[in-house]
C-alpha cells in the first residue's frame, strides 16, 4: 500500500493473507470462502493444499494467527494468464469454517443498490501487506483511502505504451488520485476495495486489487481493481453449487461457471 | 327287523378365543369385538401425539392375529408419548429449553439463537415445536436446523471498536 | 421375501471414514420399522451401533453417537452408515438388520489399517 | 446402558440333551428381548422375539421364557445343527445391548 498508514485491530478483519510462493491477499465471505484475483492463486493451481492461508491477524509475520486451508480454488472461466486481467477474480473454499469474532469477520457482497455507493469520486479503502513506498513489503497491515476515477479517464490512462490498447474493460474499475502517492502495489494483489454502505453501515467488497502501472502510485495512473458486482451471479452460483459448508472432505469438484481447481497459488502481484 | 345303517358321529369344533385385548394406555384397539376366534386381528392406534413402540424400537402400524392356539402372535405395543430427543447442536449458536429443562416430548418448544454481534439467523426465528412425528419442527413446516449467518462488513472504522 | 445386502469398502485408513449401504429388497424401508447397523469385532459380541425409523428419525448408541451418522435415500430403498474418526478398533464385521432382528444382511467385514 | 449377562459362555452338551441358556439384564426390560443364533462366519439368525415368540420356521424344540430381568432360551432335545453361539437382545431401552454370548459345543 502506497501512501497509507497502519491499520488498527477490527479495522479490516475480512483481510486474508495467502501464502504460496509469495504474498497475495483475499477477502473473507461468510466463514468458509476467500475472494481473491485468479492471477494471484493461478500459477500453483495444481496443488490447493499448499496454499497457507492467514487471517486474524494485523502483523504479516506474527506466529499469531488464525490458519485455514484450501479445500478447492475456482478461477473464472474467463480469466486468461498472462493475456490481460479481464474476469481477475477466484473463490478459494476453505476446508472448514473459521470462527467468527471481532478480528475475524466476512466482507459482504454488494447488493443491487451498491453502485450508489462506488461513483467517480466515492472513497474506497484498500489495505494489504504489499510494498510501500520505502520499497519493502509491509510488517504491519496497511490501509489507503482512495476515490473512484471516471472509467473513461482510467482507460485513456492505460491507452499510451507500453500498455496494450483495451486493458482496462468494463469489469474493472480503478482508484486513485491524479497526483498519484495513493495506491496499492505488488504484494496488495487480490485483496478487497472496500466501501461503506451508509444505509446498512456495513462494508462491502467493490473491487479487488489486480493490476496497475509499473510504479505503484505514479501520477496520471491508477490502480485497477476487478469490478466485483459484475460478478456476483459467478459468486453465488459457484457457493451455492459447493456448498456454504467447509466440511474438510473435499470430493471431487464439477465445472460449473468456473475452472475448478483443487489448486494452490503462486502470486504475480501485479498489484 | 332293524336296518343297519352303522354308527353316525357328529363333530363340532369351538376354536380357542383370543385374550381380550385390551388397549395399552394412550392407544384404542380396532374393530371393537366381542371375542376375537382364529384368524381374526386387531390393530392398536395411538392418539395424536403418542407412538407405537415394541420396546425402543417404532413402529408405524401394529396388527395382531388370533393363533388356532388361541394366543395372539404379536404381543401387545405400548402408546408412548412421542420424545423427539435432544436438539441437535447449532453451529454458532445454542438452545434454550422453552417448556422446561431438558423437556423433549411432544408440543415442548425450544428456541434456537446465534451468537451475537457476530452471527444471525437465517432461514426462519428459531423456534421449534416437538411435533408427533417426532421431530423438531419451525413455525414454517422446517425440519432441518436454522442456521448461524456470520454477519458481514463489521469494522471497527465504523464502530469505534468493538 | 425381505432381504439386506450391505456393501462399502472392506479396507478404510485410520482418522477416514468408514462409509457402508444396506440395499433393501422385497420390503420398503418407509413402510414401517426400525432399520439398524450392528457391529460384531472380530471373535467378539454383538454392539447396536443406531437405526433409522421408517419416518427417517435416527437413535443412536451414545458409545459411538459423536462419529456416527445414519441417512437413507428412499428412491433407492437403502439407508446408509457413516463412522469417522476411525481407529483400529472399528474393525468389524457390520450388519444392517430390520426392527429387532427378524432380518439381517450377511455382513461386511471393515479392516481398518493404514 | 443395560447390561445382559449371559450365563454359562458355554457348555458341552450331546445330541438330545436338553440345553438351558440364561440371560439376566441389570434393569427391567418387559419382555422385550429377542434370542439369535449364529454360526462362524454367518449373520445372527432370529430364534425369539419379545421373550417367547417362536419365529416362522424356528423349530418348536426352541422356546423363550422370562420377562423383567431374567430370562431363558431352552433347547428341548438338542440337534446336530444346533451347535452354534447364542446371544440375547433387549431392545427394550435405549440403548440396545446384546448379552456377550453363549457357546454351545459338541461333548
Known amino acids: 500500500i502506497y501512501g497509507g498508514q497502519k491499520a488498527k485491530p477490527g479495522d479490516f478483519p475480512w483481510q486474508v493473507l495467502i501464502l504460496g510462493g509469495t504474498t497475495a491477499a483475499g477477502a473473507l465471505l461468510y466463514d468458509n470462502w476467500v475472494l481473491t484475483a485468479a492471477h494471484a492463486v493461478y500459477e500453483q493451481k495444481h496443488d490447493a493444499s499448499a496454499l497457507d492461508i492467514r487471517m486474524g491477524t494485523l502483523k504479516r509475520l506474527s506466529p499469531h494467527y488464525t490458519q485455514a486451508w484450501s479445500e478447492a480454488v475456482f478461477i473464472h472461466e474467463g480469466y486468461t494468464h498472462d493475456a490481460g486481467f479481464d474476469n481477475d477474480i477466484a473463490l478459494i473454499k476453505l476446508n472448514n469454517k473459521v470462527v467468527i469474532n471481532s478480528n475475524i469477520t466476512p466482507i459482504c457482497l454488494p447488493r443491487k443498490e451498491a453502485e450508489s455507493f462506488m461513483r467517480t469520486d466515492d472513497i474506497g479503502t484498500a489495505s494489504g501487506w504489499g510494498l510501500t513506498q520505502r520499497g519493502f513489503l509491509a510488517r504491519n497491515l496497511m490501509y489507503v483511502d482512495i476515490p473512484i476515477v471516471d472509467h473513461q479517464k482510467c482507460t485513456a490512462a492505460y491507452e499510451k505504451p507500453p500498455y496494450p490498447r483495451g486493458s482496462v474493460t468494463a469489469n474493472m474499475l480503478c482508484a486513485g488520485l491524479e497526483s498519484g502517492g495513493k495506491d496499492s502495489c505488488r504484494g496488495d494483489s487480490g485483496g478487497a476495495l472496500v466501501f461503506l454502505d451508509s444505509e446498512t453501515e456495513r462494508w462491502f467488497v467493490g473491487g479487488i486489487v489486480s493490476w496497475g502501472s509499473m510504479n505503484c502510485g505514479e501520477a496520471g495512473q491508477y490502480g485497477v481493481y476487478t469490478k466485483v458486482i459484475n460478478y456476483i451471479p459467478w459468486i453465488e452460483n459457484i457457493i451455492s453449487d459447493f456448498g456454504g459448508g467447509g466440511s474438510g472432505g473435499g470430493g471431487s469438484a464439477k465445472f460449473v461457471a468456473a475452472w475448478t481447481l483443487k489448486a494452490a497459488a503462486h502470486h504475480h502481484h501485479h498489484h | 327287523m332293524a336296518s343297519m345303517t352303522g354308527w353316525k358321529i357328529h363333530y363340532t369344533s369351538t376354536a380357542h378365543a383370543c385374550p381380550y385385548p385390551m388397549a395399552p394406555p394412550n392407544g384404542h384397539v380396532s374393530p371393537v369385538q366381542a371375542k376375537y376366534i382364529l384368524k381374526d386381528s386387531f390393530s392398536i392406534f395411538c392418539e395424536t401425539g403418542y407412538e407405537l413402540l415394541q420396546g425402543h424400537l417404532p413402529l408405524k402400524s401394529f396388527t395382531a392375529v388370533c393363533q388356532k392356539d388361541g394366543s395372539w402372535d404379536r404381543p401387545m405395543p405400548a402408546c408412548s408419548i412421542v420424545d423427539c430427543g435432544p436438539p441437535d447442536d447449532l453451529p454458532s449458536g445454542r438452545v434454550e429449553y422453552i417448556t422446561g429443562p431438558g423437556v423433549t416430548t411432544y408440543k415442548a418448544v425450544i428456541q434456537y439463537s446465534c451468537e451475537e454481534t457476530f452471527y444471525t439467523m437465517k432461514v426462519n426465528d428459531g423456534k421449534y415445536v416437538c411435533e408427533a412425528d417426532g421431530f423438531w419442527t419451525s413455525s414454517k413446516g422446517e425440519k432441518s436446523l436454522p442456521v448461524c449467518e456470520p454477519v458481514c462488513g463489521l469494522s471497527a472504522r465504523t464502530t469505534g471498536g468493538r | 421375501q425381505v432381504q439386506l445386502q450391505e456393501s462399502g469398502p472392506g479396507l478404510v485408513k485410520p482418522s477416514q471414514t468408514l462409509s457402508l449401504t444396506c440395499t433393501v429388497s422385497?420390503?420398503?424401508?418407509?413402510?414401517?420399522?426400525?432399520w439398524n447397523w450392528i457391529r460384531q469385532p472380530p471373535g467378539k459380541g454383538l454392539e447396536w451401533i443406531g437405526y433409522?425409523?421408517?419416518?427417517?428419525?435416527?437413535s443412536y448408541n451414545p458409545s459411538l453417537k459423536s462419529r456416527v451418522t445414519i441417512s437413507r435415500d428412499t428412491s433407492k430403498n437403502q439407508f446408509s452408515l457413516k463412522l469417522s474418526s476411525v481407529t483400529a478398533a472399528d474393525t468389524a464385521v457390520y450388519y444392517c438388520a430390520r426392527y429387532w432382528g427378524d432380518y439381517w444382511g450377511q455382513g461386511t467385514l471393515v479392516t481398518v489399517s493404514s | 446402558d443395560i447390561q445382559m449377562t449371559q450365563s454359562p459362555s458355554s457348555l458341552s452338551a450331546s445330541v438330545g440333551d436338553r440345553v438351558t441358556i440364561t440371560c439376566k439384564a441389570s434393569q427391567n426390560v418387559g419382555s422385550n428381548v429377542a434370542w439369535f443364533q449364529q454360526k462362524p462366519g454367518k449373520a445372527p439368525k432370529p430364534l425369539i422375539y419379545s421373550a417367547s415368540y417362536r419365529y416362522s420356521g424356528v423349530p418348536s424344540r426352541f422356546s423363550g421364557s422370562g420377562s423383567g430381568t431374567d430370562f431363558t432360551l431352552t433347547i428341548s432335545s438338542l440337534q446336530p445343527e444346533d451347535f452354534a453361539t447364542y446371544f440375547c437382545h433387549q431392545y427394550n431401552t435405549y440403548p440396545l445391548t446384546f448379552g456377550g454370548g453363549t457357546k454351545v459345543e459338541i461333548k
Open positions: 422385497g420390503y420398503s424401508i418407509t413402510s414401517d420399522y426400525a
Open positions: 433409522i425409523s421408517y419416518s427417517g428419525r435416527t
